[in-house]
């Protein structure tokens, strides 16, 4: 017997659906109506036929009471080919729900998203995460999606993007966005970062994550941030192959004084990079290739320094920097 496509945990909290049949029984998902966190994986199916069954132009207000009764707070939709019109229809209906976090992964969005009707209500998300989502509309996808959201988005994560650069002139500002995660876009690079960080569109960013994004030097990142007017408190550059030296012809970059936490772990560094901020609260240099203890003049003024997992560090060795935090145990790097 084939397993049930949807499983609801015994506390009505998590519901997971895996629709792998060519002709799935979508009604099985109704058992998820009481769940708080819902994951729907569509097995790579093309959802185009759905458009024939639903009236994408119907007034979503007729579903308002039904949708308000849903407990869902976090929704993940994955592995499908979705017509943009269907996505928009879902967003319009979900605007009446309690949904706060939406994750889209392994999706191919076909067609263009229609503009938001004047009477429509945007979706009040606090978090939007996209992983391996391709859009037929190319660089304008963020601007098109943004119009269907209320302006209170706090967390935006875009991984494995087919087009990580945005059409900046079309994008409106994200006034409440405090966390931007562009990690796992290895082709982004410092030029791509400049294109993705639309100037003055991200005024409230506190946390910027750029893990595995093809960054080359901290100084190059500093320049991209300065050009965009982005002043994060926390910057994650881990899992990039960083060069410690700076191109002598490159202009010196002044880091924002707002930056107090910098993660340079797993960056293949053989020495402390030049051009770091003068003062930091937290600096993570763990799991690099430092063959000797950094000298005080190589390091910023830092309260909390992590050097675990570097070759020079034998467990139990005296710490090289005042106020540093080191477990003395070499982590699995």
């Amino acid at each position: 017997t084939t397993p049930e496509p949807c499983e609801l945990d015994d506390e009505d909290f998590r519901c997971v659906c895996n629709f792998s049949e060519p002709q799935p029984d979508w009604s099985e998902a109704f058992q998820c109506v009481s769940a708080v966190e819902v994951e729907i994986h569509a097995g790579g199916l093309n959802l185009e036929p759905f458009l024939k069954r639903v009236d994408a132009d119907a007034d979503p207000r007729q579903y308002a009471d039904t949708v308000k009764a849903l407990r869902v707070r976090r929704l993940t939709v994955g592995a499908a080919q979705v017509p943009a019109q269907l996505l928009v229809g879902a967003l319009r209906v979900l605007a009446y729900s309690r949904l706060k976090e939406l994750t889209l992964e392994d999706l191919k969005i076909t067609g263009t998203m229609p503009p938001l009707p004047l009477e429509a209500t945007g979706l009040a998300l606090s978090s939007l995460r996209l992983r391996n989502v391709s859009w037929a509309t190319g660089r304008s996808w963020l601007a098109e999606l943004q119009q269907w959201l209320k302006p209170g988005l706090k967390v935006l994560s875009i991984a494995q993007a087919h087009s990580p650069a945005f059409s900046c002139e079309q994008v409106r500002a994200f006034p409440a966005l405090t966390s931007l995660d562009l990690s796992d876009n290895p082709g982004l690079g410092e030029r791509g970062l400049m294109a993705a960080l639309c100037p003055h569109k991200f005024p409230a960013i506190q946390n910027l994550a750029l893990r595995n994004t093809g960054m080359e030097t901290p100084t190059g990142v500093c320049a991209a941030l300065a050009a965009a007017g982005v002043q994060p408190h926390s910057l994650d550059l881990s899992h990039n192959s960083l060069r410690a030296t700076v191109n002598p012809s490159a202009p010196r970059c002044m880091w924002s004084s707002a930056l107090n936490s910098l993660n340079l772990s797993f960056a293949g560094l053989e020495q402390v990079p030049k051009g770091l901020p003068a003062k930091l609260r937290v600096l993570d240099l763990s799991c690099n290739r430092l063959n000797r203890a950094p000298q005080p003049d190589e390091l910023p003024e830092v309260d909390n320094l992590t050097l675990d997992g570097n070759p020079f560090l034998v467990p139990g060795t005296a710490l090289p920097h005042e106020g540093s935090m080191n477990s003395g145990v070499v982590p699995a790097c």
Partner: antibody, heavy 115, light 111 residues
Framework: QVQLQESGPGLVKPSETLSLTCTVS?????????WNWIRQPPGKGLEWIGY???????SYNPSLKSRVTISRDTSKNQFSLKLSSVTAADTAVYYC????????WGQGTLVTVSS | EIVLTQSPATLSLSPGERATLSCRAS??????????LHWYQQKPGQAPRLLIY???NLQSGIPARFSGSGSRTDFTLTISSLEPEDVAVYYC?????????FGQGTKLEIK
């Protein structure tokens, strides 16, 4: 059988940050469910503070949201509460609890806010 | 937020009597077929203990003299025949919508 155990200082000074950790045994906090903090001031009723879910998603009581952070350490199967800028009104027994129908409770730890 | 109001504040009964505790919600705590209203018992110095979940389901290990009923906004916890060990404070709680809220409690005393 899932077991939860709170730990942390029993005395915190006003304006400082209260920090508690809940260690979970017999169940992985990344499997499913919500992992909550609930408190009870002496002689009073129960108040939900917030949760971190199996996915890492958080939800907080709006009355405390500006002061609360709930985080987790999946390698230790622990989740933690930080409550900043505490006052005497934050003196309470703090419980860590699994689920949204609260079937599994820690034994609770009394935190007193006093100078 | 959903406000839960419990009544009476105190209930004083004799062993063997039937206890009826009420919980009223400021708005519906139903989501489709389920009522997300739960009942707890708390004895002095102990953590609360789940008695009834989703309005009418008896939590495992709880004696059958405890039962729950109701839907939408009106709920009742019934103890069919009071035992001396039932002296405690009883709380209702809703998990239909965050913030998840508790009633103020009903104190059950034995005469």
């Amino acid at each position: 059988q899932v077991q939860l155990q709170e730990s942390g200082p029993g005395l915190v000074k006003p304006s400082e940050t209260l920090s508690l950790t809940c260690t979970v045994s017999g169940y992985s906090i990344t499997s499913d469910s919500a992992w909550n903090w609930i408190r009870q001031p002496p002689g009073k009723g129960l108040e939900w503070i917030g949760y971190i879910s199996y996915s890492g998603s958080t939800s907080y009581n709006p009355s405390l949201k500006s002061r609360v952070t709930i985080s987790r350490d999946t390698s230790k199967n622990q989740f933690s509460l930080k409550l900043s800028s505490v006052t005497a009104a934050d003196t309470a027994v703090y419980y860590c609890v699994r689920g949204l129908r609260f079937a599994y409770w820690g034994q609770g730890t009394l935190v007193t806010v006093s100078s | 937020e959903i406000v839960l109001t419990q009544s009476p504040a105190t209930l004083s009964l004799s062993p063997g009597e039937r206890a009826t505790l009420s919980c009223r919600a400021s708005e519906s705590v139903d989501s489709y077929v389920n009522s997300f209203l739960h009942w707890y018992q708390q004895k002095p110095g102990q953590a609360p203990r789940l008695l009834i979940y989703r309005a009418s389901n008896l939590q495992s290990g709880i004696p059958a003299r405890f039962s729950g009923s109701g839907s939408r906004t009106d709920f009742t916890l019934t103890i069919s025949s009071l035992e001396p060990e039932d002296v405690a404070v009883y709380y209702c709680q809703q998990s239909n919508e965050d913030p998840y809220t508790f009633g103020q409690g009903t104190k059950l005393e034995i005469k």
